[in-house]
């Protein structure tokens, strides 16, 4: 059993400075080139080694870019989005959505908050069951008094 894969979504403002080879990443997506089904958003497909984005370190492959210099990237054709990046100037402000994959279940990665690696529901279910049994026993005992 693989467990369920969830995503932790965070947003970040990233200010990038254009380098000799541009901003140093490639994009996919757009209304005419959907990268994710039912989502015409713009995504980072590749970060170029030694480029501006790679050396900055914050942008990651798979990130969704929500805006460039405050301009929303919703409902844009792919080429229009490309042009927007190309004409964005020297210092570029990107609003970015990171999606961190979090796996729940038996083979989930052991995170800092879960040192034993036991999924939280496996702890909560027995605790809840014991509480219910105790409550039922108490109520029954009270009725006998």
């Amino acid at each position: 059993m693989n467990g369920r894969v969830d995503y932790l979504v965070t947003e970040e403002e990233i200010n990038l400075t254009r380098g000799p080879s541009g901003l140093g990443f490639n994009i996919v997506g757009g209304t005419d080139q959907q990268y994710v089904s039912n989502d015409s958003g713009i995504y980072v497909s590749r970060i170029k080694e030694n480029g501006a984005a790679a050396l900055d370190g914050r942008l990651q492959e798979g990130d969704k870019i929500l805006s460039v210099n405050g301009q929303d990237l919703k409902n844009l054709l792919h080429q229009d989005a490309v042009d927007l990046f190309r004409n964005a100037g020297y210092a570029v402000s990107l609003r970015v959505q990171h999606r961190l994959q979090v796996q729940n279940g038996p083979i989930g990665h052991r995170g800092e908050g879960d040192p034993s690696g036991i999924p939280i529901f496996m702890v909560l279910v027995p605790v809840f069951a014991l509480t219910m049994v105790a409550a039922w026993a108490f109520m029954r005992y009270r009725q006998q008094l």
Epitope: E49, N50, G51, A54, L55, D56, G57
Partner: nanobody
Framework: DVQLVESGGGLVQAGGSLRLSCAAS??????VGWFHQPAPEKRREVVA?????????YYTHFVEGQFTISRDNAKNTVYLQMNSLTPEDTAVYYC????????????WGQGTQVTVS
């Protein structure tokens, strides 16, 4: 064990210069960056970074022409030359490194204080 040790910080008058050093040990890195944190409640921001292999550099627009990042492979050290310093450059400067070519920096130094009066 990975270690990044910064040095060279201190108090300097406006208009002056400082050279920060970051001595790296424990492994070969792909990238090394210098970050600054002007106040504890503010986040660390990259000011300059360098590719260990190619020597390609990156600067944020507000320090380009003022700061210079360089590396000495023989000494396993990365430098940040800071010129024409202003009070706005006052911050704790951190060295960070990664053995991956992209993504977040995984290793951090303890930081060195730079104060411009």
């Amino acid at each position: 064990d990975v270690q990044l040790v910064e040095s060279g910080g201190g108090l300097v008058q406006a208009g002056g210069s400082l050279r920060l050093s970051c001595a790296a040990s424990g492994r070969t890195f792909s990238r090394v960056g210098w970050f600054h944190q002007p106040a504890p409640e503010k986040r660390r921001e990259v000011v300059a970074a360098i590719s260990w292999r190619s020597g390609d550099t990156y600067y944020t627009h507000f320090v380009e022409g003022q700061f210079t990042i360089s590396r000495d492979n023989a000494k396993n050290t990365v430098y940040l030359q800071m010129n024409s310093l202003t009070p706005e450059d006052t911050a704790v400067y951190y060295c960070a490194a990664s053995d991956k070519s992209t993504g977040p920096y995984e290793y951090w130094g303890q930081g060195t204080q730079v104060t411009v009066s």
